[in-house]
């Protein structure tokens, strides 16, 4: 069945922590992604950005998690209104920003 929201959020946080702690070389060879507004619909928006990164084993599990948590189909090149379209950042920074926001949501009990 569907993953409970609190479990999904906790697992995603754990994976992002794992990525940031195990990072040696530049994450995803320094690939750049669109920054997103960390608001409602965040899982889908994050996936829309990260799905454009390919061949990066370090974020494959994150992509799988976001794909499972986003209720609609997302394909490469797709953009929602949640993207800050004029701002590209490195995947490493994207992961850090997302992690900080998810931790805040978890502390506040906002699981959806």
């Amino acid at each position: 069945g569907p993953v409970p929201p609190s479990t999904a959020l906790r697992e995603l946080i754990e994976e992002l922590v794992n990525i940031t702690q195990n990072q040696k070389a530049p994450l995803c060879n320094g690939s750049m992604v669109w920054s997103i507004n960390l608001t409602a619909g965040m899982y889908c928006a994050a996936l829309e950005s990260l799905i454009n990164v390919s061949g990066c084993s370090a974020i494959e599990k994150t992509q799988r998690m976001l794909s499972g948590f986003c209720p609609h189909k997302v394909s490469a090149g797709q953009f929602s209104s949640l993207h800050v379209r004029d701002t590209k950042i490195e995947v490493a920074q994207f992961v850090k920003d997302l992690l900080l926001h998810l931790k805040k949501l978890f502390r506040e009990g906002q699981f959806n």
Partner: antibody
């Protein structure tokens, strides 16, 4: 245009080693995953292993001890090396590039035929 | 490794009829609500061609007569109606775990 082309020795002696090169164009190996797949004559497909854009390498468990995959991104080449060859390693060897997530094998080379025989 | 078993090994279907190919996995290929099962078509003398990804998503340019379904361990590729150019061998493939695997293949003959 995405292209992959395999080149190999054609004939290898039993007990010897095999080196195949996959030369790619139309994309960069720094952000693409390349798989190696083989197909014995008249038989099915067998996944051998892969190298990710960020350098991670995964191997099929059954062949892990005999396989080595590497790449030279600056030359747009991926390499497959196999040791202790047997006659049942005779096959067409393909390299295939994953598409974006969910990483299915979207682009394929035409394959190179390898015969293991004395 | 996850073992994929395809059935039947071969089948003959009349032009315009439905062809159904099954793929059974030795363990679940689902991860976070998605099924990491893909389908390929291989014609004689050619490399494989991706048809369907994530169990049911049609690859760009693939005719709508091809469809995929299933989850966890049981998957189906359906071709309806079958055309003459569909004569080929079809393979399922999983990447739910790091070590990917293919099914043994199903050869489709058009009557």
């Amino acid at each position: 245009e995405v292209q992959l082309k395999e080149s190999g020795p054609g004939l290898v002696a039993p007990g010897g080693s095999l080196s195949i090169t996959c030369t790619v164009s139309g994309f960069s190996l720094t952000d693409s995953s390349i798989n190696w797949v083989r197909q014995p004559p008249g038989k099915g497909l067998e996944w051998l292993g892969m190298i990710w854009g960020d350098g991670r390498i995964d191997y099929a468990d059954a062949l892990k001890s005999r396989l080595s995959i590497s790449k030279d991104s600056s030359k747009s080449q991926v390499f497959l090396e196999m040791t202790s060859l047997r006659t049942d390693d005779t096959a067409t060897y393909y390299c295939a590039r994953d598409g974006r997530f969910p990483y299915a094998m979207k682009f394929w080379g035409q394959g190179t035929s390898v015969t293991v025989s004395s | 490794d996850i073992v994929l078993t395809q059935s039947p090994a071969s089948l003959a279907v009349s032009l315009g009829q439905r062809a159904t190919i099954s793929c059974r996995a030795s363990e679940s290929v689902d991860s976070y609500g998605q099924s990491y099962m893909h389908w390929y078509q291989q014609k004689a003398g050619q490399p494989p061609k991706l048809l369907i990804y994530l169990a049911s998503n049609l690859e760009s340019g693939v005719p709508a007569r091809f469809s995929g379904s299933g989850s966890r361990t049981d998957f189906t590729l359906t071709i309806d109606p079958v055309q003459a150019e569909d004569a080929a061998t079809y393979y399922c493939q999983q990447n739910a775990e790091d070590s990917r695997t293919f099914g043994g293949g199903t050869k489709l003959e058009i009557k």
